[in-house]
Interface confidence: medium
Amino acid sequence: KDDDDKVPQLYWDDLKKMLSEKLDTTDFTSTIKLLNENSYVPREAGSQKDENLAWYIENQFRECKLSKVWRDEHFVKIQVKDSAQNSVTITGTNSEFVYLVENPGGYVAYSQNATVTGKLVHANFGTEKDFEDLDSPVNGSLVIVRAGKITFAEKVANAESANAIGVLIYMDKTKFPIVDADVSFFGHAHLGTGDPYTPGFPSFNHTQFPPSRSSGLPNIPVQTISRAAAERLFENMEGDCPSDWKTDSSCRMVTSQNKSVKLSVSNVMKEIKILNIFGVIKGFVEPDRYVVVGAQRDSWGPGAAKSSVGTALLLELAQTFSDMVLKDGFQPSRSIVFASWSAGDFGSVGATEWLEGYLSSLHLKAFTFINLDKAVLGTSNFRVSASPLLYALIEKTMQEVKHPVTGLSLYQDSNWASKVEKLTFDNAAFPFLAYSGIPAVSFCFCEDTDYPYLGTTMDTYKELIEKIPQLNKVARAAAEVAGQFMIKLTHDVELNLDYERYNSQLLSFLRNLNQYRADIREMGLSLQWLYSARGDFFRATSRLTTDFKNSEKTDRFVMKELNDRVMKVEYYFLSPYVSPRESPFRHIFWGSGSHTLSALLEHLKLRKTNNRAFNETLFRNQLALATWTIQGAANALSGDIWDIDNEF
């Protein structure tokens, strides 16, 4: 081409302005409203309406003129309610009376099917600490817990650890101020993500894996009940709930002496076909490197806040970025993949199955995941959970984007990073980070209190617009946050991942570990090697920064080699010493299992607080493997094998 024909170079300020102007003319509420019309609601995973919406999204992607649009089919097992209703009853100890409390409208997927009878004990939110603080032992008893604070799966796992025989979950009016006390709700109890019957491997139709079962499935029955049902149970219980629980005055602690509660759950397994829909805008320089932007499509109830907002953001961002590329001269270096997942309600099943299908290669290609789920749950606060690799990007974006109502910058607290909450099991970004080692971010505009209607039949567009009258403005701000992430990640020559941020994470871990140096010495162990590994990691990051500074930004080959080193950082924090099948969430910082740094610290604490539960051999293993994982990350970041100091 002649120089005259060259596309003018677009800079960050040009692209930021372009994005902002396009979003100003986007009608998000109409799209959200459309996604909540009768033809798409309710859309439980695998249902006809879920498939209808999948087709619609696929067509929209095609109309956006994305470079390529495709779909993945998975065959997964979910649990649905049986025609025989689940029930909660109160009986006399000698069965002299039986009183039906409720046949609940909702249910908890992946509950154990069983009928259990026993006394009922209130365990607040069902956190580990809540169980520790209880006066009444729960072994052999059912427990009733409030929704909120932690996932249903964690509540059930904690109850099971305390030897409870069943779990009831309700929404108290204090935390969930819903007028209608009979509202039913839904959740799942799989302490993990993906299809729990194909743990660690994908559920494509042609993959003949032997029967298997996730260790994160519960072995006790669990059921959601309405607030009205909980109040009927409380009428048959005694002992006021502690005032520091800050719950309803009707709350009671334990069933009366002569009464028992019976829980009967008979859900059924169902194999369903789910569709993940994808579209891509191909990068102009490195099309094989991509940022993935995803949203859950399915929903047990109407799912306005849970899945319609995220899906609307996905569709509008696809349209916006396609226009920027096709009409306005934006030439992203790297690709952008738009993904609509199904079966999110059952534990990020669609997203995880995709990750499992490409486990060996995805971390070499996908360098960031941006989750759009539940991005708008309120107006007051902007909250974010992410890999530390993305903190610098997030901070820059917060400084650039204005709050949709106050007009002030989203960056109001220089200490925001220390308040970031870990990604949890119920977030689609979690498996990207903890299972696949791909940096991931999830964010929301929200209130201090939970959005009360998630997972209920009241998660309608009507309630959403009533709770958030300025929905269009807030959705626009959410799109601008995601859009700026996307531009910065695909446009800049140097990959926008702050690999140096893990230095402070490692330092923080070592500080915590150092509190127990006396215990470590008593076991004849030393932290020298761990400090050495941390030092090597620090030196590797410094060297990489120097390499970037000294490199010619126009030398694509050199930049690609440096960027590839950055891309591997997150992945190398996945413990290579545990099996993805047995411990899928291998990340030593953000995963779950005994290989994590937090598990190592919790275990070491037991040496003082509960010595009988402390296992020195296990601890020695934990320390050695953590050290080697960190050392491995340092080595990977250093570059070629002949550059690595092997004195270690």
């Epitope: 100003d24 003319t25 986007t26 009608d27 998000f28 509420t29 109409s30 959200i32 409203k33 459309l34 019309e37 309608t460 567009y461 009507k462 617009i465 009533e466 009258p469 300025q470 929905l471 269009n472 403005k473």
Partner: antibody, heavy 122, light 106 residues
Framework: EVQLLESGGGLVQPGGSLRLSCAAS????????MNWVRQAPGKGLEWVSG????????NYADSVKGRFTISRDNSKNTLDLQMNSLRAEDTAVYYC???????????????WGQGTLVTVSS | SYEVTQPPSVSVSPGQTASITCSGH??????ACWYQQKPGQSPVLVIY???KRPSGIPERFSGSNSGNTATLTISGTQAMDEADYYC?????????FGGGTKLTVL
């Protein structure tokens, strides 16, 4: 003070065209969706068309789809309704109405103009 | 297409409570609002989002919406409340008005 002033009404023959305008003042025009609502003599209210604050999204009643076009000029704070292929049943007072928020998403019409009469007759 | 139905007329004595209904399939799942229109005047919004009152509208006007019916209630009806009342909702991307109810204060 919010003001909406319609103009452009009058007598027109069946099959003819007419362009209604609504001049808005007293609020940030581009931040609000706008609508046209009509009322035939002695009859009830009938929604005709709506447009989002940016002008990117437009909607029409089935009875006027393909014949009427709604548009806005945010630099001039005006809302227009181009009416083609007019029929006798289009005879009505046409009101311009401001929506409470910038996007047509279950928001009420909090301000109305005084209306302009359109008569379609031969 | 979606329709909402109102009674053509309702009569009430001064000081009494007037109730005007608006019915439509699963109307409670949608928002309803109400407009008052006096002869020769433009409509005025009196209730929005089922039960909210714009500033300047007297407290005697209230609204509710559940099941298939939205209701506008005027307690302690005054002669000045005599007017046509229209309920309005949304279906898909269109705005739906009821046929209107003439409230007569006897």
């Amino acid at each position: 003070e919010v003001q909406l002033l319609e103009s452009g009404g009058g007598l027109v023959q069946p099959g003819g065209s007419l362009r209604l305008s609504c001049a808005a003042s007293g609020f940030t025009f581009s931040s609000y969706a706008m609508n046209w609502v009509r009322q035939a003599p002695g009859k009830g209210l009938e929604w005709v068309s709506g447009i989002s604050g940016s002008g990117v999204s437009t909607n029409y009643a089935d009875s006027v789809k393909g014949r009427f076009t709604i548009s806005r000029d945010n630099s001039k704070n005006t809302l227009d309704l181009q009416m083609n292929s007019l029929r006798a049943e289009d005879t009505a007072v046409y009101y311009c109405a401001k929506e409470d928020y910038d996007s047509s998403g279950y928001y009420p019409f909090d301000y109305w103009g005084q209306g302009t009469l359109v008569t379609v007759s031969s | 297409s979606y329709e909402v139905t109102q009674p053509p007329s309702v009569s009430v004595s001064p000081g009494q409570t007037a109730s005007i209904t608006c019915s439509g399939h699963k109307l409670g799942d949608k928002f309803a609002c109400w407009y008052q229109q006096k002869p020769g005047q433009s409509p005025v919004l009196v209730i929005y989002q089922d039960r909210k009152r714009p500033s300047g509208i007297p407290e005697r006007f209230s609204g509710s919406n559940s099941g298939n019916t939205a209701t506008l209630t005027i307690s302690g009806t005054q002669a000045m409340d005599e007017a046509d009342y229209y309920c309005q909702t949304w279906y898909s991307s269109t705005v739906i008005f009821g046929g209107g109810t003439k409230l007569t204060v006897l």
